[in-house]
């Protein structure tokens, strides 16, 4: 994913009838006018703001890569949602990229967890049920597997 | 279902003050923005401030500011809209409206009150 | 403040007519902008907003369109029940401000 975040610039509105300690705050889907008095629309797929802010400039949306499916467009309170493809998946240490998940288990191990978007199979060893990090299966001994299909958002 | 009931019509004298209440209904009260939006006899419609009850957030147009205070009592789910120093323009109907916390249109109003400013 | 100046102020149609309402705003809104119908004596209901998107519930016949300072509301087939006055808002920068509506009766 490409997230394409300008940085998260903030100010503190001017002292003007500070009727609570929030005033100078605007909604989700706006940002704050440089001179604190306005709160300005973020613009429709192009960029957002989540939460109550001060920012001078909304956040711009995220553009799912090749290899990825957009589960949810970008609107002005939520950035977009992507998914890794189906057979691929993205790892917590290695977010930026999707990667292929692995045809099968090596042998001496049997599979316990499908291919999903966010984990490659499980395999675990036929004996003592212990779990295998693994690399690329034995050639010898596959157990094929189908894609998983829950979502999870990737932004 | 979503209400947003409002209190009933005042006549007011020039000068004096008038608070109209707007008790809303059917929905988590700290999940949305409240509005008032005034609209004079045969004109248009003007949005004055908004109150939001899960941060206490008020905004006010610039115009009213000097005069009107949005507040609310979230034990019972109303927001106040307190305007002072009333002269005979603002004779109005007053609403209340509500809105997501995203773009600023309004997908409920209430039912107006009729504000009369007159000697 | 941004002025939404929208026109005709008054409409007269026949049923089954197709009718078109402009709003103009004074700077660029992007697609900002919402649509209300007002009946007599009532509170406005929202009709479309995001320029184009209909409002749950509000009929076919209603869609918006536009971008930037130039927005339509169109009805694509008058009904009885659409007689109301018609304004549109932009919800791009506060103050969000209003035009000042479109009367729209039966010939």
């Known amino acids: 994913i490409t997230q394409q975040d300008l940085a998260p610039q903030q100010r503190v509105a001017p002292q003007q009838k500070r009727s609570s300690p929030s005033e100078g705050l605007c909604p989700p889907g706006h940002h704050i006018s440089e001179d604190g008095r306005d709160c300005i629309s973020c613009k429709y797929g192009q960029d957002y703001s989540t939460h109550w802010n001060d920012l001078l400039f909304c956040l711009r949306c995220t553009r799912c890569d090749s290899g990825e499916v957009e589960l949810s467009p970008c609107t002005t309170t939520r950035n977009t949602v992507c998914q890794c493809e189906e057979g691929t998946f993205r790892e917590e240490d290695s977010p930026e990229m999707c990667r292929k998940c692995r045809t099968g288990c090596p042998r001496g191990m049997v599979k316990v967890g499908d291919c999903t978007p966010w984990s490659d199979i499980e395999c675990v060893h036929k004996e003592s049920g212990t779990k295998h990090s693994g690399e690329a299966p034995a050639v010898e001994e596959t157990v094929t597997s189908s894609p998983g299909t829950p979502a999870s958002p990737c932004s | 279902q979503v209400q947003l009931v409002q209190s009933g019509a005042e006549v007011k004298k020039p000068g004096a003050s008038v608070k109209v209440s707007c008790k809303a209904s059917?929905?988590?009260?700290?999940?949305?923005?409240l509005h008032w939006v005034r609209q004079a006899p045969g004109q248009g419609l003007e949005w004055m401030g908004w109150f939001y009850p899960g941060n206490n957030n008020i905004k006010y147009n610039e115009k009213f500011k000097d005069r009107v205070t949005i507040t609310a009592d979230k034990s019972t789910s109303t927001v106040y809209m307190e305007l002072s120093s009333l002269r005979s323009e603002d004779t109005a109907v007053y609403y209340c409206a509500r809105h997501e916390q995203g773009p600023g249109y309004f997908d409920y109003w209430g039912q107006g009150t009729l504000v009369t400013v007159s000697s | 403040d941004i002025q939404m100046t929208q026109s005709p102020s008054f409409l007269s149609a026949s049923v089954g007519d197709r009718v078109t309402i402009t709003c103009r705003a004074s700077q660029d809104v992007n697609t900002a902008v919402a649509w209300y119908q007002q009946k007599p004596g009532k509170a406005p209901k929202l009709l479309i907003y995001w320029a184009s998107t209909r409002h749950t519930g509000v009929p076919s016949r209603f869609s918006g369109s536009g971008s930037g300072t130039d927005f339509t509301l169109t009805i694509s087939s008058l009904q009885p029940e659409d007689i109301a006055t018609y304004y549109c808002?932009?919800?791009?920068?506060?103050?969000?401000?209003f035009g000042g509506g479109t009367k729209l009766e039966i010939k």
């Open positions: 808002q932009q919800h791009y920068i506060t103050p969000w401000t």
């Open positions: 059917g929905y988590t009260f700290t999940e949305y923005i």
